[in-house]
Interface confidence: medium
């Protein structure tokens, strides 16, 4: 969690002086209690918005907008604690307005906004507003919380922001996985314009369980310029293992941006409506390490080799 | 060469957990899963589950499901399994070995023993 | 699950001698079973697997045959090193299993 590193940040308005500042998340008015304190925020809404940075940089932020009830206790807001929690985290980062005059009653409502949180793609935050000061220990709260979902990086938004740009976003690799018989699947898909080795994981399952029953990864060395774009397949080899039916493809890319932690692809190939009857099953080819020379990744239980082309 | 190398022989009481490490070298880790298999005393061999130390997923023989915990750090190259709830029959040398199916390699053996 | 059924459960063979391990399945694992070696206080040692394939290292005396339901271990002339226990595996089906073991001793 960060705020965008842009611009000095801005909390006046017409009839308020404010400021921003950095907080500990832990308000003084949490240490020595008032009397006085003011009533909660009202109406808080949190929205996707897109903020470039000083370098260019597109990402995306939290928008917090909320607006002050119509009571007197707006006679002892000091300012406001805007508090971001990442939920699988926990990791929380709040900044404090605060006020440097007295708000007065005018004809429209009081409202307020921040739009500086950085925010990652794909996760969930909970975002609080603490009106300051601070109730006292058994006073009624005064803050307001909602959870806030970021869309990942397949929503087209997000698609061209630059975290999901620097994992790869912009590939699209069109992956189509086709049941040659029995024993073999074929994978195609689309390289993109990088140098760069990609990894495919082919996890098969039985036909309604989740745990996987048989897990073999193939490696595809980087391609050359001129197959930039173009398609490429390979033929993986499966293990003839009882009810292991279900078969899912992920494609992993290795990136310069990414490197191990690029966005992956997979597609699912399921069970036979009908299970056929069975084939023999060819002589098994060795499911050790080649004593010499494959430049082929044997996951677990490989039994067969996988070969990849690259078509113009 | 290929190696895995377990920690060493723990005494627990009955109800306590053990977790048993695994570190593996000489081969790129996560290129392969690992299976982990226990032996009682004068006994056979018995499969507990397995491993992918490249997604994670996990198969766990039935009997030892919601009392087993497979993980894997592959920073270090290391796989582990928790037992959890120990009792008596489960004094035994735990196997750690590579492979999802069938295991090329096998550690030393850590035997585990469970009395009051 | 597929139980797997080891015969005999001790075998007495002089040195030089052939040594045939029989494994039976409770149902068809197809080609997919191991054998392994254990000697006293060791790990496990792979043999042979998918059926009759002899895994690295593994001296040419030792080799596998069998498929569906009936698997055979034969050791054509017994070495000193080989008096151990010996166990089949299928991997067709979940949970993997073990058979009880065949002990091979000196006669």
């Known amino acids: 969690l960060r705020l965008l590193d842009h611009r000095a940040l801005v909390c006046s308005q017409p009839g308020l002086n404010c400021t921003v500042k950095n907080s500990t998340c832990l308000d003084d008015s949490w240490i020595h209690p008032r009397n006085l304190t003011p009533s909660s925020p009202k109406d808080l809404q949190i929205q996707l918005h897109f903020a470039h940075t000083q370098q260019g940089d597109l990402f995306p932020v939290a928008h917090i907008e909320w607006t002050l009830q119509t009571d007197a206790s707006i006679l002892y807001l000091e300012g406001a604690e805007l508090s971001v929690l990442q939920l699988n985290t926990n990791e929380r980062l709040c900044v404090k307005f605060q006020f440097l005059s007295m708000l007065q009653h005018h004809r429209k409502r009081w409202r307020f906004s921040f739009s500086h949180f950085v925010v990652d793609p794909g996760q969930e935050y909970e975002v609080t507003v603490h009106h300051l000061p601070k109730p006292i220990p058994d006073g009624d709260p005064n803050h307001q919380s909602k959870n806030f979902l970021v869309p990942d990086c397949e929503h087209a938004r997000m698609k061209v922001t630059t975290p999901c740009m620097s994992s790869g976003s912009l590939w699209d690799p069109n992956i189509t996985v086709e049941t040659l018989d029995t024993q073999h699947l074929r994978v195609d898909f689309t390289l993109w314009n990088e140098s760069t080795h990609y990894q495919i994981l082919l996890t098969s399952f039985p036909h309604m369980e989740n745990h996987s029953c048989f897990e073999h990864m193939h490696h595809i060395p980087a391609p050359r310029p001129e197959e930039f774009h173009q398609r490429s397949n390979v033929t993986l080899t499966l293990r003839n293992l009882k009810g292991c039916c279900r078969h899912q493809v992920q494609i992993q890319p290795f990136f310069s941006s990414c490197l191990n932690d690029c966005l992956r692809h997979s597609a699912t190939v399921s069970c036979p409506e009908m299970p056929d009857t069975p084939e023999p099953i060819p002589d098994y080819m060795p499911l050790w390490e080649p004593r010499s020379g494959s430049s082929d990744y044997k996951d677990d239980d490989d039994k067969g080799s996988s070969h990849h082309h690259h078509h113009h | 060469q290929v190696q895995l190398v377990q920690s060493g022989a723990e005494v627990k009481k009955p109800g306590a957990s053990v977790k048993v490490s695994c570190k593996a070298s000489?081969?790129?880790?996560?290129?392969?899963?690992i299976s982990w298999v226990r032996q009682a005393p004068g006994q056979g061999l018995e499969w507990m589950g397995w491993?992918?130390?490249?997604?994670?997923?996990?198969n766990y023989a039935q009997k030892l499901q919601g009392r087993v915990t497979m993980t894997t750090d592959t920073s270090t190259s290391t796989a582990y399994m928790e037992l959890r709830s120990l009792r008596s029959d489960d004094t035994a040398v735990y196997y750690c070995a590579r492979r999802q199916l069938y295991f090329d390699y096998w550690g030393q053996g850590t035997l585990v023993t469970v009395s009051s | 699950e597929i139980v797997m059924t080891q015969s005999p459960a001790t075998l007495s063979v002089s040195p030089g001698e052939r040594a045939t391990l029989s494994c039976r399945a409770s149902?068809?694992?197809?080609?997919?079973l191991a054998w392994f070696q254990q000697k006293p206080g060791q790990a496990p040692r792979p043999l042979i697997y998918?059926?009759?394939t002899r895994a690295t290292g593994v001296p040419a005396r030792f080799s596998g045959s069998g498929s569906g339901t009936d698997f055979t271990l034969t050791i054509s002339s017994l070495q000193s090193e080989d008096f151990a226990v010996y166990y089949c595996q299928q991997y067709d089906n979940w949970p993997l299993t073990f058979g009880g073991g065949t002990k091979v001793e000196i006669k």
């Open positions: 491993i992918s130390t490249y997604s994670g997923n996990t």
């Open positions: 000489g081969y790129t880790f996560t290129r392969y899963g």
């Open positions: 149902q068809s694992v197809s080609s997919n």
């Open positions: 998918d059926a009759s």
